[in-house]
């Protein structure tokens, strides 16, 4: 007799990433009796909701059930009709909505309602939207990346069965950019970890971890640049603001009330005799950097060592992957290649930057040019960020990775938030029978 | 859970200044304004004036301007109502409370009295 | 300013019966479709205890007589079946705008 095909036995999760300028959702699915062996979790689908990032809606809440739709539906098609009302569906909010909340938890509150009353008409199993800390943004993302590297198995392969493997089982760091706040997170090596805030204490199949994190708000790349447009027009001598970090060329007209819109600049508000001004570039990548480490407050320090703002940040120990914007950005201006130094990435940089705005659209003529302006200002703000702020060094530069994907699996938070949730992570090691790998002692 | 706790009372002559405590425990302390709002003797609730603690920005009300500075120490988690050139009428119940424009969680008060 | 006014200054009512105050804003204050109108309870030697946010939403912990409605400029707080331990000050507050205003506060005392 033949053989008939067994109906395939997976489970599927659905996170949603709320950022401060994009919501994207992201389809896992895992054979359902594997769930707790590390690895098997895997992405099949990412999906970019068109639009700005929900805490852009508070005057328009009525337009985010349509905002939300494509995304929704083409989950809908994605995972197959018998399994969507037991698939959870997780939505996570980040610095957007944490920055929004710090203006009016009202406000925050109607949009997550209006997201949860959207959310709440799709067949899937809705477990809620909310926003997550910037403590657990860096914890997810540092799960994350170390479950697609396999670094929680406990079986040691003598292949490599991922990029940047290495045999042993010391797991890397997390490097996170978003658009308003970025985080860092490592396993110190040693090292008390002197801020009780910056302290993570896991256990995961079987094995401790003491992990340091922090999340700097106001810190992603877009929130930086406000910042530093804050920072910068305090002392321009009239409405004309000649800014290095972008191209020869450029101009754009800039709101004085939306610069002061977000609490990110609220340390550089002043009356000002003039309700716009023009940014004019100038292209100077020196002056840039410059100016970004203005943002950076490192004369202040009340442990052993600080990031900046008086922040603890241990030794940096081991491998790191940088990924969200860290990767976009630094892919776009083709450095994320392994073997480029530090030293030739801002060799790079300062030539990207001194190129006419005229030059660069001819050459980029498919990017949207609110995004192409800000590549230089990009790309010098992570050079800043992770050399001054971080105190990455030319030496140590080499083991940073700029990862976009993990075995198809995009690197972020959203993994490691639904395997917790879906208590898909064990505190022990599984033990498996000889017979079966779906059975548990 | 969230708690502000706030230092002991006061007691100033005419003319000085006096700083009032607000420590901050149970969440992100740089996530969350902090707000300060003081109420004399048988008297409204009066809004001095709120901190970012994140940056340090600070806003007040025009009644309070230029006498009133709000600072934060981030790595205590502690916010900081320094009021100068004190007089009589400033003796009040200064309290610290968090939100951004809802204060959910107050601290328990610091009653300041100014007399000579 | 936004200017909050509040009425009655004091309110006797019998136990289990209901308390009705009023606040009316001098503007409104309303923005984004949110009423930023909040009711706040105070006891002596105590701080303020938020019962309602939003002009109508309950605040942790605070029981369901506690009500409040309005939009615009005028709100109103009821308490359904006043109970003994209701008896303190409540106070209006608008935040939609700086300076952050407070009405003069109401006395709810047992008749």
């Known amino acids: 007799t033949q053989n008939k095909a067994l109906p395939e036995n997976v489970k599927y999760g659905i996170v949603l990433d709320a950022g401060s300028s994009h919501t994207s959702l992201y389809i896992y699915k895992w054979p359902a009796e594997k769930e707790n062996d590390t690895g098997v979790v895997h992405q099949v689908e990412e999906c970019r909701v068109k639009g700005p990032g929900i805490s852009k809606f508070v005057q328009k809440v009525n337009e985010i059930g349509i905002y939300l739709t494509d995304c929704m539906e083409r989950a809908r098609e994605v995972i197959p009709r018998s399994q969507h009302q037991e698939t959870p569906v997780y939505l996570g909010a980040t610095a957007g909505m944490r920055l929004l909340r710090m203006e009016s938890e009202e406000l925050a509150d109607r949009v997550l309602d209006v997201v949860e009353r959207s959310l709440s008409n799709y067949p899937f199993d809705f477990q809620g939207a909310r926003i997550i800390t910037g403590q657990e943004e860096g914890a997810y993302g540092w799960i994350t990346i170390n479950y697609l590297l396999g670094k929680f198995s406990q079986k040691t392969r003598w292949f490599s069965i991922v990029p940047y493997e290495t045999n042993n089982q010391e797991t890397f760091g997390a490097l996170d950019l978003g658009g308003a706040s970025t985080q860092v997170t490592f396993v110190p090596q040693n090292q008390t970890i002197e801020s009780p805030d910056n302290a993570l204490q896991f256990r995961l199949y079987g094995k401790d971890y003491n992990v340091y994190t922090h999340s700097f708000l106001c810190y992603g790349k877009d929130q930086a640049l406000w910042q530093k447009l804050a920072k910068d027009i305090q002392v321009a001598s009239n409405e004309i603001l000649r800014d290095p970090c972008f191209h020869p060329g450029y101009k754009k007209v800039v709101n004085v009330s939306d610069l002061y819109k977000t609490p990110c600049t609220k340390r550089f508000e002043m009356t000002l005799p003039f309700q716009q001004f023009e940014i004019q570039g100038i292209g100077n990548y020196q002056q840039c950097h410059q100016s970004i480490l203005e943002l950076f407050n490192t004369s202040y320090c009340p442990y052993s060592q600080c990031a900046f703002n008086g922040i603890f940040l241990p030794p940096l120990q081991g491998d790191f992957g940088a990924f969200s914007a860290f990767y976009f950005v630094m892919k776009f201006l083709n450095l994320t290649s392994e073997k480029v130094s530090q030293e030739k990435v801002t060799e790079m940089m300062k030539k990207f930057c001194a190129q006419p705005w005229e030059e660069i659209k001819t050459s980029y003529a498919g990017v949207k040019e609110k995004y192409l302006s800000e590549y230089c200002f990009s790309g010098t703000y992570i050079l800043s960020l992770l050399l001054q702020g971080y105190h990455f060094t030319a030496d140590s530069w080499e083991h940073i990775h700029f990862i976009g994907k993990i075995q198809g699996s995009d690197a972020g938070w959203t993994l490691g938030y639904m395997l917790n949730l879906t208590n898909m992570i064990p505190a022990e090691q599984p033990l498996s029978t000889p017979l079966s790998h779906s059975t548990y002692v | 859970q969230v708690q502000l706790v706030q230092s002991g009372a006061e007691v100033k002559k005419p003319g000085a200044s006096v700083k009032v405590s607000c420590k901050a425990s149970?969440?992100?302390?740089?996530?969350?304004?902090m707000h300060w709002v003081r109420q004399a003797p048988g008297q409204r609730l009066e809004w001095i004036g709120y901190i970012v603690p994140l940056n340090g920005g600070s806003t007040f009300s025009q009644k309070f301007q230029g006498r009133a500075t709000i600072t934060v120490d981030t790595s205590a988690s502690t916010a900081y109502m320094e009021l100068s050139s004190l007089r009589s009428e400033d003796t009040a119940v200064y309290y610290c409370?968090?939100?951004?424009?809802?204060?959910?969680?107050w601290g328990q008060g610091t009653l300041v009295t100014v007399s000579s | 300013d936004i200017v909050m006014t509040q009425s009655p200054d004091s309110l006797a009512v019998s136990l289990g019966e209901r308390a009705t105050i009023n606040c009316r804003a001098s503007e409104s204050v309303d923005n984004f479709g949110v009423s930023f109108m909040y009711w706040y309870q105070q006891k002596p030697g105590q701080p303020p205890k938020l019962l309602i946010y939003g002009a109508s939403n309950q605040g942790s912990g605070v029981p369901d007589r506690f009500s409040g409605s309005g939009s615009g400029t005028d709100f109103t707080l009821t308490i359904s079946s006043l109970q003994a331990e209701d008896v303190a000050v409540y106070y209006c507050?608008?935040?939609?705008?700086?300076?952050?205003?407070f009405g003069g506060g109401t006395k709810v005392e047992i008749k």
């Open positions: 149970g969440y992100t302390f740089t996530d969350y304004n």
């Open positions: 507050q608008q935040t939609k705008e700086v300076p952050y205003t």
């Open positions: 409370a968090r939100g951004g424009t809802r204060f959910a969680y």
